[in-house]
């Protein structure tokens, strides 16, 4: 004896988020009379997706005209798919009954998997700046993707990094997943212009990976090197002393001149020159009237860079001797000049 079968020909269907899923179902008989219902999941907790007989299902449309008496096609389309729609869908035939219809036969089920693109990777660096030779950690996060398989790579200036750890969560089955990766990067003095890139490849991206970047200029601090030199005599009894502040980053820098330990002048780096590697140079100079001093003068250039403890460089100015050249200005980038006479 022939009996109605419910055929769901597709064991699984894969749909991109935002698209429409077609779930196919056919009955092999018009007997017994009764409606078809679609459910997600099985058992008592199953979720009604579509009822041929009654109800409002705004996201669901039928492929065929169910008012047709001889219709055996109970396929449905579900619009605007999201990862939350993933699951196994069952097409279930009911037999007309009184007072209620009775479940007659179910299809084998169709597993709907949703392909969702990962969000743009967000790369974040350490909260505080670090100096060259230090190792810093960068994190990369991307969310909302499905299926779980994903590839993440780290690059520094185009060179692939190997020191990183990656986790995809959750470990078990889920409608969508997140990836979190931490990479360790050793800073060098040349890294002001460097970039760290996190690259995420996923089946939904069709070979065009997503990238998140972090500029090491936000992370690195290159402390300055100081050089104090005495310039040739400008005029009788006047000595020009310069403080060359070289190769620093970021620009935030305050310089204080001390004369025998006493503050002579404080200034903030303004007209700086930029080096090819992105670091800065600055020069400050002090015009000292040696005739106002009986004893030797200790001149100190004290620099506070980017809120760090001050570093200093001193120069002893002999007042007993006739002023003469003591060292030379080797900085080709001398652009700033500040004058200070001591009386």
């Amino acid at each position: 004896e022939e009996e109605l079968q419910v055929i769901q020909p597709d064991k699984s269907v894969l749909v991109a988020a935002g698209e429409t899923a077609t779930l196919r179902c056919t009955a092999t008989s018009l007997i017994p009379v009764g409606p078809i219902q679609w459910f997600r999941g099985a058992g008592p907790g199953r979720e009604l997706i579509y009822n041929q007989k009654e109800g409002h299902f705004p996201r669901v449309t039928t492929v065929s005209d169910l008012t047709k008496r001889n219709n055996m096609d109970f396929s449905i389309r579900i619009g605007n798919i999201t990862p939350a729609d993933a699951g196994t869908y069952y097409c279930v035939k009911f037999r007309k009954g009184s007072p209620d219809d009775v479940e007659f036969k179910s299809g084998a089920g169709t597993e709907l998997s949703v392909r969702a693109k990962p969000s743009a990777p967000v790369v974040s660096g350490p909260a505080a700046r670090a100096t060259p030779q230090h190792t810093v950690s960068f994190t990369c996060e991307s969310h909302g993707f499905s299926p779980r398989d994903i590839t993440l790579k780290w690059f520094k200036n185009g060179n692939e990094l190997s020191d990183f750890q990656t986790n995809v969560d959750p470990v078990g089955e889920s409608v969508s997943y997140s990836i979190h990766s931490t990479a360790k990067v050793v800073l060098t003095r040349e890294d002001v212009h460097s970039q760290v890139i996190c690259e995420v490849a996923h089946v939904t991206l069709q070979g065009d990976p997503l990238r998140g970047t972090a500029n090491l200029s936000e992370t690195i601090r290159v402390p300055p090197t100081l050089e104090v030199t005495q310039q040739p005599v400008r005029a009788e009894n006047q000595v020009n002393v310069t403080c060359q502040v070289r190769k620093f980053y970021p620009q935030r820098l305050q310089l204080t001149w001390l004369e025998n330990g006493n503050v002579s002048r404080t200034e903030t780096a303004s007209t700086v020159t930029e080096n090819k590697d992105g670091t800065y140079n600055w020069m400050s100079w002090l015009l000292v009237n040696v005739s106002a001093h009986r004893d030797d003068v200790k001149l100190t250039c004290q620099v506070e860079h980017d809120g760090q403890p001050a570093v200093s460089k001193s120069h002893d100015l002999k007042v007993s001797a006739h002023p003469k050249e003591q060292g030379s200005n080797t900085a080709a980038e001398n652009t700033g000049s500040n004058e200070r006479n001591i009386y």
Epitope: E1, E2, L4, P9, T22, R24, T26, T28, S29, L30, I31, V33, V63, S64, D65, K68, R69, N70, N71, M72, D73, S75
Partner: antibody, heavy 119, light 107 residues
Framework: QVQLQESGPGLVKPSQTLSLTCTVS??????????WSWIRQHPGKGLEWIGY???????YYNPSLKSRVTISVDTSKNQFSLKLSSVTAADTAVYYC???????????WGQGTTVTVSS | DIQMTQSPSSLSASVGDRVTITCQAS??????LNWYQQKPGKAPKLLIY???NLATGVPSRFSGSGSGTDFTFTISSLQPEDIATYYC?????????FGGGTKVEIK
């Protein structure tokens, strides 16, 4: 009104694949919810339903032929087609395409095309 | 598959006669039954759908009845143009199946 026209070779060699096309005119193959069927009739015999395809792209084939049959639709050409593989002399018949419309019953038929399987 | 048994396989009747053909299904098919007419060298033509409904453009001398397993097709007054073979077809169960046909001739 809708008309159907079968086309394809009248002679097919044994073990080869029989390929027929049904062109729908006077209406769109994708409008409404019709079943597009293939039926054949052996010389001097009755009618045998081969299978159908419908709106969702779902096909159902007569189990007696299932392993050898493929029915497909090309909406851009307003055509549906039949492929029957590994033919033998027993597949010699007149092949009809037909539409089952809103009401039950195949209300529109092609005129039929004779296919002979012979070497 | 549902077996459809048609009888008689052929009959001869005079113009104006009432002609009756029966079709029996191997199991209950409710009223999911169609009747077709096929003239020599032509494609079949739908006459009756859902066991008793007359298809568009079909003369009223043709009628159908029955439900379950037993069905009847009647030509109330045979006309010369009715010479043809008549087939029943069930569509309650896949695969759809046809009866063996009844050839109607004029005496």
């Amino acid at each position: 009104q809708v008309q159907l026209q079968e086309s394809g070779p009248g002679l097919v060699k044994p073990s080869q694949t029989l390929s027929l096309t049904c062109t729908v005119s006077g209406g769109s193959i994708s409008s409404g919810s019709p079943y597009w069927s293939w039926i054949r009739q052996h010389p001097g015999k009755g009618l045998e339903w081969i299978g159908y395809i419908y709106a969702s792209g779902f096909t159902y084939y007569n189990p007696s032929l299932k392993s050898r049959v493929t029915i497909s639709v090309d909406t851009s050409k307003n055509q549906f087609s039949l492929k029957l593989s590994s033919v033998t002399a027993a597949d010699t018949a007149v092949y009809y395409c037909a539409r089952e419309g809103y009401h039950s019953g195949m209300d529109v038929w092609g005129q039929g095309t004779t296919v002979t399987v012979s070497s | 598959d549902i077996q459809m048994t048609q009888s008689p396989s052929s009959l001869s009747a005079s113009v104006g006669d009432r002609v009756t053909i029966t079709c029996q299904a191997s199991q209950d098919i409710s009223n999911y039954l169609n009747w077709y007419q096929q003239k020599p060298g032509k494609a079949p033509k739908l006459l009756i759908y859902d066991a008793s409904n007359l298809a568009t453009g079909v003369p009223s001398r043709f009628s159908g009845s029955g439900s379950g397993t037993d069905f009847t097709f009647t030509i109330s007054s045979l006309q010369p143009e009715d010479i043809a073979t008549y087939y029943c077809q069930q569509f309650a169960y896949l695969p759809w199946t046809f009866g063996g046909g009844t050839k109607v001739e004029i005496k």
